[in-house]
Amino acid sequence: AYRPSETLCGGELVDTLQFVCGDRGFYFSRPASRVSRRSRGIVEECCFRSCDLALLETYCATPAKSERDVSTPPTVLPDNFPRYPVGKFFQYDTWKQSTQRLRR
């Protein structure tokens, strides 16, 4: 049976993005001049509405390559573009609980 997707907020949202996006990182910090449109988007979607893994994937900094798309050059971001790196505190077990909720 179809089950509505879950909401993710705060650190749980960050950790889940961290796992989904891996080395690619993801759009995270607020630029000095204005809120990042992507950042605002994922908060509105995932925390205040509902979220699934496919949506999370769209916020990764560099799109995942598919086998059919090996020629596409990687996305190049400016050096100062805010991305969230894989953190030393990230815990797989904690993320696994979150992603299991999203998969159900």
Epitope: C9, G11, E12, L13, V14, C47, F89, T94
Partner: antibody
Framework: EVQLLESGGGLVQPGGSLRLSCAAS???????IMWWVRQAPGKGLEWVS?????????LYADSVKGRFTISRDNSKNTLYLQMNSLRAEDTAVYYC???????????????WGQGTMVTVSS | DIQMTQSPSSLSASVGDRVTITCRAS??????LNWYQQKPGKAPKLLIY???TLQSGVPSRFSGSGSGTDFTLTISSLQPEDFATYYC?????????FGQGTKVEIK
């Protein structure tokens, strides 16, 4: 100077209503997720509600869900909390606070107002 | 909901003492733990976020550590202005919850 200033508190009878306001200054209000947190006399802190930077998303603690409504007017740099069907247990100092991060509270609340006292009593 | 438990609930210390306050979460919260200081009649003040990051303007005598479920706030050398109540808060998910507070009093 970055500042939040609450107003609208007071004495109200059980079942009554009150609207709190929080005026923001010194920063770009529309860029920030905003919060209401309360503290009953002599007690600890309790999260009440949060609103997204655009105002399009809101969340509430179970204790106030269906009775309180958070909103904001970015053109006026003001956050609101409409409180209906008030109960004695809602008696507290109500603080507005600014989110320190981007993903809803993950870095805590960095700027707080001075608080406004709400007393629910007959 | 994630429950946050602080210990001790109160402590007495002297100026210059090293003070340690602990906070335990009822489930793993990674490093999403914040510490606040509150003085009587005043709003809370953010000291440390994500377990160990010192908020801008906070003196370096404050430090935080821990991950998972166990966290610590340390004041390396207690100053007169540090006598206050300290709260931990988990920012891992909703509902965002606080510890019950630790009151640091003058011995």
């Amino acid at each position: 100077e970055v500042q939040l200033l609450e107003s609208g508190g007071g004495l109200v009878q059980p079942g009554g209503s009150l609207r709190l306001s929080c005026a923001a200054s010194g920063f770009t209000f529309s860029n920030y997720i905003m919060w209401w947190v309360r503290q009953a006399p002599g007690k600890g802190l309790e999260w009440v509600s949060v609103i997204s930077s655009s105002g399009g998303g809101t969340l509430y603690a179970d204790s106030v869900k269906g009775r309180f409504t958070i909103s904001r007017d970015n053109s006026k740099n003001t956050l609101y909390l409409q409180m209906n069907s008030l109960r004695a247990e809602d008696t507290a100092v109500y603080y507005c606070a600014r989110d320190n991060g981007d993903y809803v509270g993950e870095k805590g609340f960095d700027i707080w107002g001075q608080g406004t006292m709400v007393t629910v009593s007959s | 909901d994630i429950q946050m438990t602080q210990s001790p609930s109160s402590l007495s210390a002297s100026v210059g003492d090293r003070v340690t306050i602990t906070c335990r979460a009822s489930q793993s919260i990674s490093n999403y733990l914040n510490w606040y200081q509150q003085k009587p009649g005043k709003a809370p003040k953010l000291l440390i976020y994500t377990a160990s990051t010192l908020q801008s303007g906070v003196p370096s005598r404050f430090s935080g550590s821990g991950s998972g479920t166990d966290f610590t706030l340390t004041i390396s050398s207690l100053q007169p202005e540090d006598f206050a109540t300290y709260y931990c808060q988990q920012s891992y998910n909703s509902p965002w919850t606080f510890g019950q507070g630790t009151k640091v009093e003058i011995k």
